[in-house]
């Protein structure tokens, strides 16, 4: 099976690696235009100049391209408490990270959000906090993990999932609230 | 105690159009971003769009961009998400949050209401 090619893609594999086909005339191969660039005029024949531009200030291009248009440069997303990496240039787009003892969560492929890294407390570090992954935390004996913190057993109702790490704990509750009724 | 109460969904027709309320109370609504997730029948959770307190520079997901706005009052704590051009891969529960801040979670979201995109 041959696999479904774009339009824009079809049209390229006429031609060698770092041209494009004239969308006017398919018997002539332009040269892209290099990343930081992007296609002002298609060359007007075979051998011949395409006429790329340099980007404007707030846009880039990331790779040999024959775009007509620069991409916009991202923005890093100040509600989401992300922070600037590094900064737009002509030939790459805006890095957008965390700030230190933080990390990514990806909500979506585009879209992430920076949180705290968990400290463990009432417990002990499993998995150290990574870039895009919170720290793994162990509870110690009398705690259970809830939303990655360490809470008491004592806020364990029967209805939730630490009934069974707790199990001692609600027994032993449990045990007491019954030794208390006649 | 913060309450968060959606309304204006329903069926309509694939190309037709809704617009989607949320009646905000219980914090400084003006402080807060402000997002809309949906959850298609059998699928997870998609975050669709969020707005910053000053209403500026949304954020909408590849797959509404161009189609739906989102917007603000903050004199009525009230949000909005207007959907156009409406597509089938539009019908879910729409529910509006407060953007998570301790973790990825949701702490405070409405109950939701149905959209449903068919002829």
């Known amino acids: 099976l041959v696999p479904h090619l774009g339009d824009r893609e079809k049209r390229d594999s006429v031609c060698p690696q770092g041209k494009y086909i004239h969308p006017q005339n398919n018997s002539i191969c332009c040269t892209k235009c290099h990343k930081g660039t992007y296609l002002y005029n298609d060359c007007p024949g075979p051998g011949q100049d395409t006429d790329c531009r340099e980007c404007e200030s707030g846009s880039f291009t990331a790779s040999e391209n024959h775009l007509r248009h620069c991409l916009s440069c991202s923005k890093c997303r100040k509600e989401m408490g992300q922070v600037e990496i590094s900064s737009c240039t002509v030939d790459r787009d805006t890095v957008c990270g965390c700030r230190k003892n933080q990390y990514r969560h990806y909500w979506s492929e585009n879209l992430f959000q920076c949180f705290n890294c968990s400290l463990c407390l009432n417990g002990t570090v499993h998995l150290s906090c990574q870039e895009k992954q919170n720290t793994v935390c162990t509870c110690h004996a009398g705690f259970f993990l809830r939303e990655n913190e360490c809470v008491s057993c004592s806020n364990c109702k029967k209805s939730l999932e630490c009934t069974k790490l707790c199990l001692p704990q609600i027994e032993n509750v449990k045990g007491t609230e019954d030794s208390g009724t006649t | 105690e913060v309450q968060l109460l959606e309304s204006g969904g329903g069926l309509v027709q694939p190309g037709g159009s809704l617009r989607l309320s949320c009646a905000a109370s219980g914090f400084t609504f003006a402080h807060e971003t402000m997002v809309w997730v949906r959850q298609a029948p059998g699928k997870g959770l998609e975050w669709v769009s969020h707005?910053?307190?000053?209403?500026?520079?949304?954020f909408y997901a590849d797959s509404v961009k161009g189609r739906f706005t989102i917007s603000r009052d903050n004199s009525k704590n009230t949000l909005y998400l207007q959907m156009n051009s409406l597509r089938a891969e539009d019908t879910a529960v729409y529910n509006c949050?407060?953007?998570?801040?301790?973790?990825?979670?949701?702490?405070?979201w409405g109950q939701g209401t149905l959209v449903t995109v068919s002829s």
């Open positions: 707005i910053p307190p000053d209403g500026q520079d949304p």
């Open positions: 949050a407060l953007l998570p801040k301790r973790g990825p979670w949701f702490d405070y």
